[in-house]
Interface confidence: low
């Protein structure tokens, strides 16, 4: 359905509001330096020449493409090459080279302040003296740290961002309220953030095949009843949303999951009787609650996947005749029997069988050749099972901040060249693995596990792709998404790497480490840790934890002190002589 | 939206013939192999015939080859299913579904073979 605006079509599909809020993140996630009034008044503009084609179609620019309209905004940017460099040679291209130029240009881990979160009345009073145009500074503030933000679900947030402020700045203890509240829109905004990463990456590092096929396991796990065509139906417009916003055309996107949110929720008889709830929400509540929703019973008369895949004399031409679609049937079929099994464990039981297919088939006896070919599978599924076992018997055993330890040193060891930050970053997120899936049934771990490692490791792929500096690393991102974290498991201590000259200066403390966080203090001792193993990579458990005792003690003593910046200076020392002599450097 | 519609169900005595049809839309019918499969009172689902996407592979359990003829005609997006001498033991619900799963999202239609 060709439109001869595709501006104004948007713009009706929308609203004002949400149009001006996705032109807003779209533009912030590409020019994530300019300052916020900057992109407000480019999108007031926009706004304003949208409004112009509703009104007339065929007014002059509007039968212009979203891309050229956008492009040419963003390169009116006065300071485009002071602020961005290269990144303004993007805008001597035609589209849709222009574009994706820019989208090359998305920098995940930018050069920007940590947001600080002002006094609660602070914030009440700039919510109440401006509702507008404080919730346009946090679409705004998120968009430019999480260029890959899935921007339909960025709405949502900014709803309960303003239904947290409305409810609780009326409160009588505003602070009691609200801070919990935006302590889990924040936390829960990173999950999203790294989970849609995830998505973008499967897309454009391994193309469009690789994404439909995680689509195609992960919907056949959550909607077992509904038959593999609808599910084929489901995964081809799913993967064009995705597709959208993983390319910058953020009002295309959010208009087609609004279409197919409709359109499951009308079909639902067919997809899940899972849905009735999240399909009585409102749009943006619907939307969100579909793609968390839990899977649906598996129907009770499945019979064995044998008959079709192995036993039939028929898999071979089957396979011929339309390769993708009797392995897209094969993954349905496995995934819908198998919800505790990882979306990524599927997908290797997938690549393992087409991969048997692509060998027997052009056998002498093909059956004969893929008659054992599930029994390939066991050590396929055992592997994660006796990991996530091992693990979780770890996690119980030390709890998360020790077990955040155990993996900063365990991957430290394991690629030492990748930074202190990104080290403390990963290692601590792959360590909430533990509080977020052990306490699950064994039936719900492995999904739970390896499937939100998937989506931290990516955090390391995509950190590590902006500064390489790892081999091992640049291998176990690009031979296979689905390996990524089995690839990673397997890597060894480096035995390479050339320790890291030591630096006093590294393990020099201040008072100003008394006054931070719980949560803050840890991240300054596992930054001391990590940085402890690229000095020592060979240091054992036992010497490394003797040291962090010590080091938690020296903080706890100082903390304590009347005189704590003389305290931190003459027993830092002390600390620092006997680390060294503890670790034999 | 997917939807499969069986017809041709019926009351037939033993020995006679029925050609059953099912009418498929909301996807690319000529794309999909299609089985029939059938639920006889208070039994699981039996896989009874399937046929690939061009129609020249057809497949039947053990119990009614010879009997049973599955065609389709993608220009017209159904499927057939030719019966004939029919058995009490065919009496049941007849679904026809996309692959061969024995899952079932259609309301089926009934045959039932009685003296």
């Known amino acids: 359905d060709a439109h001869k605006s595709e501006v104004a079509h948007r713009f009706k599909d929308l609203g004002e509001e949400n149009f001006k809020a996705l032109v807003l993140i779209a533009f912030a996630q590409y020019l994530q330096q300019c300052p916020f009034e900057d992109h407000v008044k480019l999108v007031n503009e926009v706004t304003e020449f949208a409004k112009t084609c509703v009104a007339d179609e065929s007014a002059e620019n509007c039968d212009k493409s979203l891309h050229t309209l956008f492009g040419d905004k963003l390169c009116t940017v006065a300071t485009l090459r002071e602020t961005y460099g290269e990144m303004a040679d993007c805008c001597a291209k035609q589209e849709p080279e222009r574009n994706e130029c820019f989208l090359q240009h998305k920098d995940d881990n930018p050069n920007l302040p940590r947001l600080v979160r002002p006094e609660v009345d602070v914030m009440c009073t700039a919510f109440h003296d401006n509702e507008e145009t404080f919730l346009k500074k946090y679409l705004y503030e998120i968009a430019r740290r999480h260029p890959y933000f899935y921007a339909p679900e960025l709405l949502f947030f900014a709803k309960r961002y303003k239904a947290a402020f409305t409810e609780c700045c009326q409160a009588a203890d505003k602070a009691a309220c609200l801070l919990p509240k935006l302590d889990e829109l924040r936390d829960e905004g990173k999950a999203s953030s790294a989970k849609q990463r995830l998505k973008c990456a499967s897309l454009q590092k391994f193309g469009e095949r690789a994404f439909k096929a995680w689509a195609v396991a992960r919907l056949s796990q959550r909607f077992p009843k509904a038959e593999f065509a609808e599910v084929s139906k489901l995964v081809t417009d799913l993967t064009k949303v995705h597709t959208e916003c993983c390319h910058g055309d953020l009002l295309e996107c959010a208009d087609d999951r609004a279409d197919l949110a409709k359109y499951i929720c009308e079909n639902q008889d067919s997809i899940s009787s899972k849905l009735k709830e999240c399909c009585e929400k409102p749009l943006l509540e619907k939307s969100h609650c579909i793609a968390e929703v839990e899977n649906d019973e598996m129907p009770a008369d499945l019979p064995s996947l044998a008959a079709d895949f192995v036993e039939s004399k028929d898999v071979c031409k089957n396979y011929a005749e339309a390769k993708d679609v009797f392995l897209g049937m094969f993954l349905y079929e496995y995934a819908r029997r198998h919800p505790d099994y990882s979306v990524v464990l599927l997908l290797r039981l997938a690549k393992t069988y087409e991969t048997t297919l692509e060998k027997c088939c052009a056998a002498a006896d093909p059956h004969e050749c893929y008659a054992k070919v599930f029994d390939e599978f066991k050590p396929l599924v055992e592997e994660p099972q006796n990991l996530i076992k091992q693990n979780c018997e770890l996690f119980e055993q030390l709890g998360e901040y020790k077990f955040q330890n155990a993996l900063l040193v365990r991957y430290t060891k394991k690629v030492p060249q990748v930074s202190t930050p990104t080290l403390v970053e990963v290692s601590r997120n792959l360590g909430k693995v533990g509080s977020k899936c052990c306490k699950h049934p064994e039936a719900k771990r492995m999904p739970c596990a390896e499937d939100y490692l998937s989506v931290v490791l990516n955090q390391l792929c995509v950190l590590h792709e902006k500064t390489p500096v790892s081999d091992r690393v640049t291998k176990c991102c690009t031979e296979s998404l689905v390996n990524r974290r089995p690839c990673f498991s397997a890597l060894e201590v480096d035995e390479t790497y050339v320790p890291k000259e030591f630096n006093a200066e590294t393990f020099t403390f201040h008072a100003d480490i008394c006054t931070l966080s719980e949560k803050e203090r840890q991240i300054k001792k596992q930054t001391a840790l990590v940085e402890l193993v690229k000095h020592k990579p060979k240091a054992t458990k036992e010497q490394l934890k003797a040291v962090m005792d010590d080091f938690a003690a020296f903080v706890e003593k100082c903390c304590k002190a009347d005189d704590k910046e003389t305290c931190f200076a003459e027993e830092g020392k002390k600390l620092v002589a006997a680390s060294q002599a503890a670790l034999g450097l | 939206e997917v939807q499969l519609l069986e017809s041709g169900g019926g009351l037939v005595q033993p020995g006679g013939s029925l050609r059953l049809s099912c009418a498929a839309s909301?996807?690319?019918?000529?794309?999909?192999?299609m089985s029939w499969v059938r639920q006889a009172p208070g039994k699981g689902p039996e896989w009874v015939s399937a046929i690939d996407s061009g129609g020249a592979d057809t497949r039947y359990a053990e119990s009614v080859k010879g009997r049973f003829t599955i065609s389709r005609d993608n220009s017209k997006n159904t499927l057939y299913l030719q019966m004939n001498s029919l058995r009490p033991e065919d009496t049941a619900v007849y679904y026809c579904?996309?692959?061969?799963?024995?899952?079932?999202s259609s309301q089926g239609t009934l045959v039932t073979v009685s003296s």
């Open positions: 579904t996309i692959g061969r799963s024995a899952s079932r």
């Open positions: 909301g996807f690319t019918f000529g794309s999909f192999g």
